[in-house]
């Protein structure tokens, strides 16, 4: 069983609409409708599992259901990244992985899913109702985050039920561009459908598997936007929060962890070693996400096993050996 961040589903108009409208008028709307539905918003799913053998051990699995190239994955606990959560692991497809106690093993399971094993005792150990969040940064979709937790009453070895309030984030750069075209098409479609009052326009409906609609937010790497777009996570259990980074993790680390965007607040900022790095041609999206990767590096790595990397930056593709040569 997995805890998924469900996105609103666009419901297509009822059958019979074509009869009410002229065939010629319907061609473009149906093409646009198909685009709107099939190009749908990406999803992130999160599964939290307490191991039956070790009550202090958790396995968090996260996956991204989108078509873009994943450029960064961040796993945090105590709430969403940037909303008080503390980073447990950061996985970058070309620079490797960092993880911190109580993370024991972070790895890519596939090109679009990761797993993280947590264990430990004392101040840094997770407890049953801790909230775990996974954030996937992907081009062109943007940045998407979902959270899950294991209820205190869950039996060891069982997975978490669906998360009541998954959080989704769409990066501004992901919304613009390709998403902008689709958005325009969908708006135009709604306009056409509304003009023909034979049937009601398609409605955005929350997914049935989630008690409330997920909250999506766009963000940019600035304190102003962070403050304006901040969405608190209601189910954080502060009694299970990890020790503060200042005490739990001494500073230091490789230079490419040096600077952090302000959207990941609540963590110490280091020297801006990336300040001279030019913004990539594909837009500031990559730079923003790399800043997030850089941030966590203020803490020395937890000595645990770790990472599986993408075979090809172009996106999901099966591969048995290096660069598919095997």
């Amino acid at each position: 069983m997995r805890t998924e961040a469900q996105v609103p589903a666009l419901q297509p108009p009822e059958p019979g609409l074509e009869g009410a409208m002229g065939h010629r008028t319907l061609v473009l709307p149906w093409v646009l409708l198909t685009l709107c539905v099939t190009a749908g918003t990406p999803e992130v799913w999160v599964q939290v599992r307490m191991e039956a053998t070790e009550l202090s051990s958790f396995t968090i699995r996260c996956g991204f259901l989108g078509s873009g190239s994943i450029s960064l994955v961040t796993v945090s606990w105590g709430g969403p990244n940037g909303a008080g959560g503390t980073t447990l692991a950061v996985l970058h497809p070309e620079r490797g992985i960092r993880q911190w106690a109580p993370a024991r093993q972070a790895r890519w399971e596939t090109q679009s899913s990761i797993s993280l094993i947590l264990e430990g005792s004392g101040a840094s150990s997770p407890c049953a109702n801790t909230t775990f969040c996974c954030k996937f940064a992907s081009f062109p979709e943007g940045s998407w985050e979902a959270c899950g937790s294991l209820p205190p009453s869950s039996d060891p070895g069982l997975s978490a039920p669906p998360t009541p309030a998954p959080i989704l984030r769409a990066d501004l750069a992901g919304i613009l561009g390709v998403s902008g075209v689709l958005l325009f098409g969908c708006v135009y479609l709604l306009h056409l459908l509304r003009r023909h009052k034979h049937r009601p326009a398609p409605r955005l409906q929350p997914s049935r598997t989630s008690p409330q609609a997920p909250r999506a937010r766009a963000w940019a790497p600035s304190q102003a936007s962070q403050a304006a777009l901040h969405v608190p996570y209601a189910t954080i259990n502060t009694s299970c929060r990890p020790a503060t980074l200042d005490t739990a993790h001494p500073h230091g680390g490789p230079s490419w962890w040096a600077s952090l965007p302000t959207h990941a607040a609540h963590r110490p900022q280091g020297p801006a070693a990336w300040a001279s790095t030019p913004i990539p041609a594909r837009g500031s999206f990559v730079s923003v996400e790399n800043g997030l990767y850089a941030q966590a590096g203020e803490r020395p790595p937890h000595t645990g096993p770790g990472l599986t990397l993408f075979p090809d930056p172009r996106g999901p593709r099966a591969m048995e050996g290096p660069l598919g040569v095997r």
Epitope: S69, E94, G96, Q105, W256, T277, G304, P311, M319
Partner: antibody
């Protein structure tokens, strides 16, 4: 055939600059990260830095000893990676290699380099 | 940075011998360990990636094992063309680092 060919090495005085080129063929250049390595005479291998693939914005990273002096860039249209070396020091004397970076995932996981170019010798001496 | 320590730094062996080279990482790197072969005046060549996976075209007499901090490269039956220097490299995170190398010489 996948191939990398370095060029641009030679004798240079301390404090001067040199630019190395790595011409790639046989694969889609923009899809992979490229790294530069060096090997001082009679010594082991040292990673110099890398430039990311197009998918990740072509970001760069360097080893501490060359940061601020060396710059890696790439020209996708020519399938060439460059290593611009400024303020050269005698300790930069080495054979410089470029290599294609690769990733694997799942139970077989690592970040590895294959193939490598033949290398070009850079001698920094007065 | 992750330090990689190789041993021995050199060894002498005969054709047909079984040769074992070890590599130790300063912290756990799971299976993110690669092995390269380098002959004098030549570029390094990838032999093993992900600790135990044989790169395409590499003879099956080469094998790798290990996980965490301790890794081993084994040549089951040394051939004349195998006399070279072998390096391990961690593929866990940047900066990518190498062991000091093990030179395999003819006895």
């Amino acid at each position: 055939e996948v191939q990398l060919v370095e060029s641009g090495g030679g004798l240079v005085q301390p404090g001067r600059s040199l630019r190395l080129s790595c011409t790639a063929s046989g694969f889609t250049f923009g899809d992979v990260a490229m790294s530069w390595f060096r090997q001082a005479p009679g010594k082991g291998l040292e990673w110099v830095g890398y430039i990311g693939s197009k998918a990740y914005g072509g970001e760069t990273e360097y080893t501490a000893s060359v940061k601020g002096r060396f710059t890696i860039s790439r020209d996708g249209s020519k399938s060439i990676a460059y290593l611009q070396m400024n303020s050269l020091k005698t300790e930069d004397t080495a054979v410089y290699y470029c290599a294609r970076a690769g990733h694997s995932y799942g139970s077989i996981a690592s970040n590895w380099f294959d193939p490598w170019g033949q290398g070009t010798l850079v001698t920094v001496s007065s | 940075d992750i330090q990689m320590t190789q041993s021995p730094s050199s060894l002498s062996a005969s054709v047909g011998d079984r040769v074992t080279i070890t590599c130790r990482a300063s912290q756990s790197i799971s299976s993110y360990l690669n092995w390269y072969q380098q002959k004098p005046g030549k570029a390094p060549k990838l032999l093993i990636y992900g600790a135990s996976s044989l790169q395409s075209g590499v003879p099956s007499r080469f094998s790798g094992s290990g996980s965490g901090t301790d890794f081993t490269l084994t040549i089951s039956s040394l051939q004349p063309e195998d006399f070279a220097t072998y390096y391990c490299q961690q593929g866990f995170y940047t900066p990518w680092t190498f062991g000091g190398g093990t030179k395999v010489e003819i006895k």
